[in-house]
């Protein structure tokens, strides 16, 4: 029985050119995390394997940095980065847990209605 839950950073609105951190945390289970995959739509961005460490997909190497922890840092954001990101926790013996984060990247001039952007 899968008892765990995934907590995420929550949805994020950010400014073009900035950087953000996507993070998930698996709690309420004693299952062992064997691997965490980060995906956007059907694209694999990165893998953090418990034994082999991090692998960043070649097409994202310039703009994606591993960490902090099992999270992912996206840099030099573009409007095209807008979309849903998935953290997929592969665990034993529970199986797979998935968290979802929606990132909206806006042009600097589009700070409508006094939006506060997150640029660490």
């Amino acid at each position: 029985m899968m008892t765990g839950t995934i907590e995420t950073t929550g949805n994020i609105s950010a400014e073009k050119g900035g950087s953000i951190i996507l993070q998930c945390h698996l709690s309420s289970t004693t299952a062992q995390v064997t691997q965490v995959n980060w995906e956007q739509q059907d694209q694999l961005l990165a893998i953090c394997n418990a034994d082999l460490g991090w692998h960043i997909s070649p097409s994202f190497k310039d703009r994606v940095a591993p960490g902090p922890g099992l999270g992912l840092t996206l840099q030099s954001l573009t409007v095209n980065d807008t979309g849903e990101y998935f953290c997929i926790y592969h665990t034993y013996p529970d199986g797979t847990y998935t968290g979802r984060i929606f990132l909206e990247v806006l042009e600097s001039s589009v700070a409508e209605h006094g939006a506060r952007f997150q640029i660490p």
């Epitope: 095209n80 979309g83 849903e84």
Partner: antibody
């Protein structure tokens, strides 16, 4: 003036599929997400999902995966929602609504499309 | 999914009353950068829902200043300082911080 004009009411048979349209005007269509919302029994509101016109991305409420498919035609500034394998549970009013940039909410709504599933 | 609970379900009022509607979420609606995506809508019979408040407390364009929003974390409130006839209808809160977005069950503002 921002306007979202939805297609008219539909009476469809169980098991059939149908597509609702939402024609946008008065703003740059590709610059905003388009959301879809279901209202059942004249009360409960449920977020179905959204489409990102500028890169083709989507985000769905898992409860509607396999039930709703969201698309757009950028050339006509029209968003579509196809509803599949309809049952009586899908009888509802469906709204399209423009995303409010930077705030994960919806600012302008279509007038709604009533869908009745009945044999 | 985040569960959003609105109270009361029904709110009988007289015109001129000050009223409050509460919205509570099953987890915090502040994201990791401290932003909270909570909005309020009014849905009148025969019309489309209309945005009143976004980002907890920002009034949308054209919304009268008798409407105000407040709160943080998991507890939020919509206040109407002086109820007018055109304010009657169903009020909904919406959380957009976590996927999927979820609405409260609604509060019916009706005449006593």
């Amino acid at each position: 003036e921002v306007q979202l004009q939805q297609s008219g009411p539909e009476l469809v048979k169980p098991g059939a599929s149908m597509k609702i349209s939402c024609k946008a005007s008065g703003y740059s269509f590709t610059g905003y997400t388009m959301n879809w919302v279901k209202q059942s029994h004249g009360k409960n509101l449920e977020w179905i999902g959204l489409f990102i016109p500028y890169n083709g991305g989507t985000s769905y409420n898992q409860n509607f995966r396999g039930k709703a498919t969201l698309t757009v035609d950028k050339s006509s500034s029209t968003a579509y929602m196809e509803l599949l394998s309809l049952t009586s549970e899908d009888s509802a009013v469906y709204y399209c609504a423009r995303g409010l940039r930077g705030f994960f909410s919806m600012d302008y709504w279509g007038q709604g499309t009533s869908v009745t599933v009945s044999s | 999914d985040v569960v959003v609970t609105q109270t009361p379900l029904s709110l009988p009022v007289s015109f001129g009353d000050q009223v409050s509607i509460s919205c509570r979420s099953s987890q915090s609606l502040a994201n990791s950068y401290g932003n909270t995506y909570l909005s309020w809508y009014l849905h009148k019979p025969g019309q489309s829902p209309q945005l009143l408040i976004y980002g907890i407390s920002n009034r949308f364009s054209g919304v009268p200043d008798r409407f105000s929003g407040s709160g943080s974390g998991t507890d939020f409130t919509l206040k109407i300082s002086t109820v007018k006839p055109e304010d009657l209808g169903m009020y909904y809160c919406l959380q957009g911080t976590h996927q999927p977005w979820t609405f409260g069950g609604g509060t019916k503002l009706e005449i006593k």
